[in-house]
Interface confidence: low
């Protein structure tokens, strides 16, 4: 019996087609992915084919304006057009609470939404029965799926779930939701999450009876043989995990932002055991037509952003790179402009000692979510800032001594290379990493701005000093693993909208073309 | 038990309208397309409109298109065929069928596998 | 005039083997797959087989469907006296932009 698994993940908003680098489309004809073009391409492979499930992964929510102006409902109502089997919860469906979560999307949803283990307490605990479950049984032809979900237990480091909810640990959660599944005699099971290529394989190797894992978070690539687009694959797809009890397990992930379409083919025996397993990644570009209906629908729901983000703030004359694989991993121009626009916001000239009261930015890469194309007529909207920084956070004043910053930088590439999120772009500090030592013990330099100093130049780093430090809210609070600036802060003062800081600093520039200049260095 | 129990039928004039009706149950009624069938006495099945789970792709057969409309109300569990400018060549036995997808266009791999017992419309003078 | 075209009618007898065939065009058969439907006299249509070969359950495995090109086939085997009805193959047709079903083949068991 043979089943095909479409699946995607991290479509994080792209409802519309995008370029080639997942920002905002410019030209129509190179442009690629879009809720419009995976529906044709989805039903294809359901004409074509009996056993069809389409999988979501997780983080619909957030990225583009798409989500800042419906918060949710799009997701819904497109996914249900497009008549998704499922989804797993992602951390970002959690960006505007579990409110946010349970209105738009889990009251609105007419597919299961899935995870094993997160458990509901206190008060929620009744109010969000049954609107999200550990798993589905699915028909498929003649036959029966089970469907598992599970979400980072990080969650509550990425998001923002409130305390009635618990995040357990994937494996340990999701066992006995397998074994309940087996107990009623489903023999063909799917795990379906967002945590991460390394957990997903985890899973794979230790959850007995998961015939398969399909997963996201990672932005994961995998792909057999020559690759489409410009992503690198992490490997072949299906990447296959032997269990510790001596199956083999593919595992797969369709990298992000609705670009691919993974297809897997999935040949089960009677006993529901997995005999065979192929298929890639398909890439969602130009050559595959939009739905007529769905782009129709898309352009009803596009009037309401059109009037809110479209007029033009000011100009870029360079490229603003705010790739994940750029600014995950080295510095980037689109980091260094906003924590130019975040110091500019802060300009208190407070005496004739101090040129300002604060010199310094970070600002983690993973919360910068799109490039800007230069090539519109280098034209920067704030619907392109809000593909850039789409969690409507604030840019907060912070005072840290020395030595938690040491700690924040050291954390910053304490598993530096898997493209997670806590990489610092930086303003007014000069750092120099040395990777070849152990975790922990990577910061070689770091300079910083003077701000008691008429002519600004760098100097090292005191531990023992206070500083002033301007950073996300998502930082202050601990995000992105950063426990140690939300335990050893000494003063927390809230800032303004991130977008606005941006938009602002923009508009007062009127031409910009910030450089990559030397401010994060490898030894 | 899932049910299709079409009403509506009857002997109409030439020229005149009739509205069938088709009550759904046993089913997520919203969770697929919907069609009307018909069949004229001793001949074949004609498919005459189709429409999907949403209302968002609708389609007819050349012999009804510009006379007759096809319509759902999901809160109802209903689907509807108006039927305008109605022709002798009309007549049949009308039938109302479930699809095993949701949408209307091209996903012809889905079948019809609920149909209703039909309901019968003349048209004669 | 009907775009996909069957045999009026076909005949065999109980236990052997028959064949029903459908024939129509690029724009129906051959760019999209096929369903069949029987209908027992006096009774409403039930579908027989979806995406050329699949059965919904219920279907009897004696029941098989296949398609080659611009045409389809019904093979029913082990006959059956029970099996004596009209079937309908049908297809979606691109340049009618709708649901076409064939003539019909009224299918008689003999003896």
């Known amino acids: 019996w043979e089943l095909t698994i479409l699946h995607t993940n991290d479509v994080h908003s792209r409802l519309e087609q995008t370029s080639e680098d997942s920002s905002k489309c410019v030209n129509a004809s190179r442009c690629m992915g879009g809720v419009a073009r995976l529906f044709t391409k989805v039903q294809q492979i359901r004409r074509a084919e009996p056993n069809v499930l389409l999988l979501d992964a997780g983080d619909q929510y957030q990225g583009t304006i798409w989500f800042t102006v419906y918060k949710g409902a799009e997701v819904a109502h497109f996914m249900n057009a497009l008549r998704y089997d499922a989804m797993a919860l992602g951390n970002h469906e959690f960006d505007n609470g579990v409110e946010g979560l349970i209105e738009p999307l889990l009251k609105e949803a007419k597919f299961p939404i899935l995870s094993a283990n997160i458990k509901a307490k206190g008060p929620l605990a009744s109010q969000i029965s049954g609107l999200y479950l550990p798993y589905k049984v699915l028909p498929v032809g003649d036959e029966v799926v089970g469907i598992v979900g599970y979400t980072s237990k990080e969650t509550p480091f990425l998001s923002n779930p409130g305390t009635n909810l618990v995040f357990e640990d994937e494996i340990t959660a999701l066992q006995p939701e397998v074994d309940k599944l087996k107990t009623l005699n489903v023999n063909k099971i799917i795990a379906l999450g967002h945590s991460g290529f390394e957990t997903d394989k985890l899973i794979a190797q230790k959850v007995r009876g998961v015939d398969v894992v399909v997963g996201g978070h990672s932005n994961t690539f995998l792909y057999t043989g020559n690759p489409p687009s410009k992503e690198v694959p992490a490997g072949k797809y299906p990447f296959i995990v032997t269990s510790d009890d001596g199956r083999k397990v593919p595992v797969v992930q369709a990298y992000a932002f609705g670009k691919y379409l993974g297809y897997l083919k999935i040949e089960f025996d009677e006993r529901g055991n997995v005999i065979s397993s192929h298929g890639n990644p398909i890439l969602l570009n130009s050559s595959i037509p939009e739905d007529p209906s769905i782009k129709a629908d898309i352009n009803k729901w596009r009037i309401k952003l059109d009037n809110y983000s479209t007029q033009e703030l000011g100009k870029t004359i360079v490229y603003l790179d705010g790739s994940s694989q750029s600014c995950r991993f080295r510095e980037c121009n689109m980091g260094n402009l906003i924590c130019d626009a975040m110091i500019n916001n802060n300009l208190r000239h407070a005496d004739e000692m101090f040129w300002n009261h604060v010199s310094m930015c970070i600002l983690n890469g993973g919360g910068i979510r799109s490039p800007i194309d230069e090539r519109n007529n280098g034209t920067i909207t704030w619907e392109n800032l809000a593909a850039v920084l789409p969690f409507g956070g604030t840019f907060d004043l912070v005072q840290l001594k020395g030595s938690t910053l040491k700690k924040a930088f050291e954390h910053s590439v304490h598993r530096y290379g898997q493209s997670t999120g806590e990489f610092l772009q930086v303003g007014g500090i000069h750092v120099v990493y040395d990777l070849s030592r152990k975790p922990g013990d990577r910061v070689v330099k770091l300079d910083v701005l003077c701000t008691k100093c008429r002519v600004p130049s760098y100097d090292p780093l005191k531990m023992d000093e206070i500083y002033k430090v301007i950073l996300p809210n998502f930082l202050a609070n601990g995000g992105d693993g950063f426990q140690m600036i939300k335990d050893e802060l000494l003063r927390h003062d809230s800032g303004d909208q991130d977008i606005n800081v941006v938009s602002t600093y923009i508009s007062k520039m009127k031409v910009i073309y910030p450089a990559v200049e030397g401010r994060i260095k490898f030894s | 038990e899932v049910q299709l129990v079409e009403s509506g039928g009857g002997l109409v004039q030439p020229g005149r309208s009739l509205r069938l009706s088709c009550a759904a149950s046993g089913f997520t009624f919203d969770d697929y397309a919907m069609h009307w069938v018909r069949q004229a006495p001793g001949k074949g099945l004609e498919w005459v409109s189709g429409?999907?789970?949403?209302?968002?792709?609708?389609g007819y057969a050349d012999s009804v298109r510009g006379r007759f409309t096809i319509s759902r109300d999901n809160a109802k569990n209903s689907l509807y065929l108006q039927m305008n400018s109605l022709r002798a060549e009309d007549t049949a036995l009308y039938y109302c069928?479930?699809?095993?997808?949701?949408?209307?266009?091209?996903?012809?791999?889905?079948?019809?596998?609920?149909w209703g017992q039909g309901t019968t419309v003349t048209v004669s003078s | 005039q009907t775009v996909v075209t069957q045999e009026p009618s076909a005949s065999g007898t109980p236990g052997q083997r028959v064949t029903i065939s459908c024939s129509g065009s690029?724009?129906?058969?051959?760019?999209?797959?096929v369903n069949w439907y029987q209908q027992l006299p006096g009774t409403a249509p039930k579908l027989l087989i979806y995406s050329n070969n699949q059965r919904p359950s219920g279907v009897p495995d004696r029941f098989s469907g296949s398609k080659s090109g611009i045409s389809a086939s019904l093979a029913i085997s082990g006959l059956q006296s029970e099996d004596e009805a009209d079937y309908y193959c049908a297809a979606w047709d691109d340049s009618l932009n709708g649901r076409v079903f064939g003539g019909g083949t009224k299918l008689t068991v003999l003896g």
């Open positions: 690029s724009s129906n058969i051959g760019g999209n797959t």
């Open positions: 429409i999907s789970w949403n209302s968002n792709s609708i």
């Open positions: 069928a479930k699809d095993m997808g949701w949408e209307l266009l091209k996903t012809s791999y889905y079948g019809m596998d609920v």
